[in-house]
């Protein structure tokens, strides 16, 4: 507890002090007072530097004195032999004695009293910036006119802070400008403009004179500009040292002017204005900006349009352009959007063809569709090459975005038929020689595949069974072989309207218009054992002449068997119709004259006993295409005959091409792509 005065006596005083003693006293007087310590008696063993016994006076970390020996007062009117005056309110006194004393020493007697200190004069550092006023136990600071005392109660400054400037243009100057600015002041000015405008500060060099920096380069008085996390300055010296035009990139600016106690100059004056916040002219690849300007500012809107082949992808939606607005923060809206190369995606697959997995599906990439050769070819041309176009579609030069269509190659057997002299008079064949050959099991007959969905046959084959079961792809027709082949399911049978339906078909003598089409439920997959035969063209090139050779195939009656198990075939010449008329009907069901012969019939055979027979009906009479020797077309269909092993009659397919085409077109279902 602080006291105003007190007494300090060495141990046993006034008796001799003991050896090996160390005692300390902590003196404390109230705040605002100093301590006057004085000794009235001093009798301590004398030694050099008071090394043996001593009384030590310590103020804080400073030793104020160390006493030993004997002292007596110099003033007969005062008992004080030694005294100390400290301007602090704390003091420590330490007494020490060593292990022996040569004589008897009585120690010391000391007193302390609290004394007033003059804070205004007693210290090197003046406590007040301006006026200091001392009183007993303390002091107070005061300020000249127009100055106020800061919260620290020591420093005076001018009231130059708190101004907020919101106008888009203005002028700010230091206090008293151009007269000297106040010392020891911190002036803060705030400029707060509407968002989207940046504060631009302009100064003239001659409008700036602030106390120069010290030898270390530190400004004693300084002007600082703070805009968000950016700082300009500190600036000081004669003439403005910074840029005369400061673009702050911010709508808020704090101006801080700090002065010290010395060296007042005229100060500074500045102008400011609000510029619409500029947005950088960004280099956005693969795009063009509209409108194009040298500089873009707050509220400017640009349309960024991607170059051809590039698109903006936002979520799942692709667009070719987007709008961007220069925002109040100096940044563009939609800045994350970029023009990326258009991605055409994985190309669609096509029926009976393929497309290699592309290395890239981006703009400019190229893919190639191919058909499953040699069984399919590209019907709609274009070469199959597609490139990824700017609109995100795979595009072909000829077809545009339309996909190629792979259609069956017609009339090309995988293995050519080699005629063997052994059908009647014919020889064994392989289905690869006649991949268009269709087997009907009820009645036992034939047909010709003409495309993926259609089978051509004789009307008399299907007139009694409108839901025939058909097979393709097998040389042999045992049940086990057929089970391993492809069964075709009919959707509808179309018999030529000119075919006369009879109640008793067995007695038929008129086979005119003996032609029918079977529409299949599902498309047939082509391959080495299954592929269509071509239809004849309509030109005169496809008019048959006597002696023209054609191939017939089927599982009909042979010399040895009622029905063949393995496919048989023969090569026959076309003969004049009269040759067929001249042959006597083997088992006539009517008068020979009743049998009808028309230009819709082809007569063929008569050589070496080669002929079609019962069970071959509906099969194709295949003739080499006059315009493409690699292909065969169905010139005829096995129809009827007077006698097996002689001449046979075949429906002349050329006369029905229009009907065939019309029937197929009217009954085609659009491909589900």
């Amino acid at each position: 507890e602080p006291t105003m005065y007190g007494e300090i006596l060495s141990p046993n005083y006034p008796q001799a002090y003991p050896s090996e003693v160390e005692k300390s006293w902590d003196i404390e007087v109230p705040e605002g007072y100093g301590i006057h310590l004085y000794f009235t008696h001093l009798d301590i063993e004398l030694s050099e530097n008071c090394a043996y016994d001593s009384v030590q006076i310590i103020s804080g970390d400073t030793e104020e004195g160390r006493l030993c020996g004997q002292r007596s007062s110099n003033n007969p009117h005062s008992p004080i032999v030694e005294e100390f005056q400290v301007p602090y309110n704390k003091l420590q006194v330490i007494f020490k004695s060593d292990f022996s004393n040569e004589e008897r020493f009585t120690g010391f007697a000391a007193y302390y009293v609290a004394t007033d200190i003059n804070e205004c004069t007693d210290f090197v550092d003046v406590p007040c910036s301006h006026f200091c006023n001392n009183f007993i136990g303390g002091y107070f600071c005061s300020c000249p006119p127009e100055y106020f005392l800061h919260d620290d109660m020591k420093n005076c400054g001018v009231n130059c802070s708190g101004d907020v400037f919101t106008a888009l243009i203005g002028e700010i100057a230091s206090p008293n400008y151009p007269k000297p600015y106040p010392e020891n002041s911190r002036c803060e000015y705030q400029i707060r403009l509407e968002k989207g405008f940046q504060v631009v500060v302009t100064l003239r060099r001659e409008d700036f004179d602030v106390e120069a920096a010290d030898s270390a380069g530190n400004c004693l008085d300084s002007l600082v500009f703070v805009a968000g996390d950016r700082q300009f300055g500190p600036y000081c010296g004669h003439g403005f040292p910074g840029p005369l035009n400061i673009e702050t990139k911010s709508n808020a600016l704090d101006i801080i002017f700090q002065t010290d106690l010395t060296g007042q100059k005229k100060g500074w004056k500045l102008r400011y204005h609000g510029d619409p916040m500029p947005c950088p002219k960004e280099d956005t690849p693969n795009s063009v900006w509209e409108p194009a300007k040298a500089k873009y500012v707050f509220r400017d809107v640009v349309q960024i349009t991607c170059l051809d082949g590039f698109e903006v992808v936002e979520g799942r939606v692709g667009a070719t352009s987007f709008y961007s607005t220069c925002q109040s923060n100096g940044k563009w809206s939609n800045s994350k959007l970029k023009c990326q190369p258009v991605d055409c995606g994985i190309p669609e697959s096509i029926e009976n063809g393929k497309v290699e997995d592309p290395e890239s599906t981006l703009f400019g990439s190229v893919i190639r569709y191919t058909c499953e050769e040699p069984y399919y070819y590209m019907e709609n041309g274009g070469g199959g090459e597609y490139h990824c176009a700017g609109n995100g579609s795979w595009v072909n030069e000829v077809l545009g975005p339309e996909l190629p269509k792979c259609v069956p190659v017609c009339g090309v057997p995988r293995e050519p038929f080699e005629e063997k002299q052994r059908i009647i008079g014919g020889s064994d064949a392989d289905i690869k020689n006649f991949p268009w050959q269709v087997f009907f099991d009820n009645p036992w007959a034939g047909g010709a595949l003409i495309n993926e969905y259609w089978v051509l046959t004789a009307a008399h084959v299907v007139e009694g069974n409108r839901e025939p079961t058909m097979y393709v792809g097998s040389t042999s027709v045992q049940t086990s072989r057929l089970a391993k082949s492809k069964m075709l399911t009919p959707e509808h049978v179309f018999i030529h309207p000119g075919w006369k339906l009879l109640e008793v078909p067995e007695g038929r003598t008129n086979f005119d218009n003996d032609i029918a089409l079977v529409r299949l439920k599902d498309p047939v997959k082509m391959g080495p054992t299954v592929s269509p035969i071509c239809l004849p063209g309509t030109s005169s090139d496809y008019n048959l002449m006597d002696g023209d050779l054609g191939l017939i195939s089927g599982w009909g009656r042979t010399e040895k068997r009622d029905r063949a198990v393995r496919l048989k075939a023969a090569r026959l010449p076309v003969a004049p119709l009269r040759k067929c008329k001249e042959v006597k009907v083997e088992k006539p069901t009517a008068d020979a004259e009743a049998y009808v012969f028309t230009p819709n019939m082809i007569c063929a055979g008569g050589e070496k006993g080669m002929d079609s027979c019962k069970g071959d009906s509906g099969g194709a009479f295949a003739v080499q295409d006059p315009n493409d020797k690699t292909k065969f077309y169905a010139a005829g269909l096995v129809s009827w005959g007077p006698q097996c092993g002689t001449y046979g009659l075949y429906t002349r397919v050329k006369n029905y091409v229009d009907w065939i085409m019309k029937t197929m077109q009217e009954n085609s279902t659009p491909r589900e792509d």
């Epitope: 002299q421 064994d428 045992q478």
Partner: antibody
Framework: QVQLVESGGGLVKPGGSLRLSCAAS????????MSWIRQAPGKGLEWVSY????????YYADSVKGRFTISRDNAKNSLYLQMNSLRAEDTAVYYC???????????WGQGTLVTVSS | DIQMTQSPSSLSASVGDRVTITCQAS??????LNWYQQKPGKAPKLLIY???NLETGVPSRFSGSGSGTDFTFTISSLQPEDIATYYC?????????FGGGTKVEIK
Amino acid sequence: QVQLVESGGGLVKPGGSLRLSCAASGFTFSDYYMSWIRQAPGKGLEWVSYISRSGSTKYYADSVKGRFTISRDNAKNSLYLQMNSLRAEDTAVYYCARDETDYAYDNWGQGTLVTVSS
Amino acid sequence: DIQMTQSPSSLSASVGDRVTITCQASQDISNYLNWYQQKPGKAPKLLIYDASNLETGVPSRFSGSGSGTDFTFTISSLQPEDIATYYCQQYEDYPLVFGGGTKVEIK
């Protein structure tokens, strides 16, 4: 007249190989499907393999599949049977036969004996 | 695979006797069946094709019948030269399987 003559038979150790040949004459060889049929001593007939006229289609009995290969050379009027990884149970007289048409064998060779024994 | 069961495996008959051999298929083979004759030390010879058709040059005492799974081969009047082993063979499916054979002897 039609003649089929087999050759290439003989004694071979298990695991060994042999190539049988069948020379055809008296008919147009390329007109006909051909087969190999074997008969183990004192046993019945066992069909081994079949080949189409062009040679593009071939069939094998399960017992020889993967070990035997049938082939033909129409230019040389010859039928062949390459036999690898032979086993004791392959011991038999091997006949080549002409498929007259529709799987009926109307002409056979005299046969060649293959003996597989160590 | 289709199994062909031939019976009897052997038989003894007198000259002039009617001899019947049966062949049973393990599944329906329609009429896809042939009959062969093999004399000792000789190659087989085709007698009947398609279950019932007599091969050219074969004596008419030989005949065949049946369809589906059950087939019969008949020698209407056994002759000394008919001593041989007879085999049926199916061709409905691969593998082409022969019956086990029937050995015919003269009493």
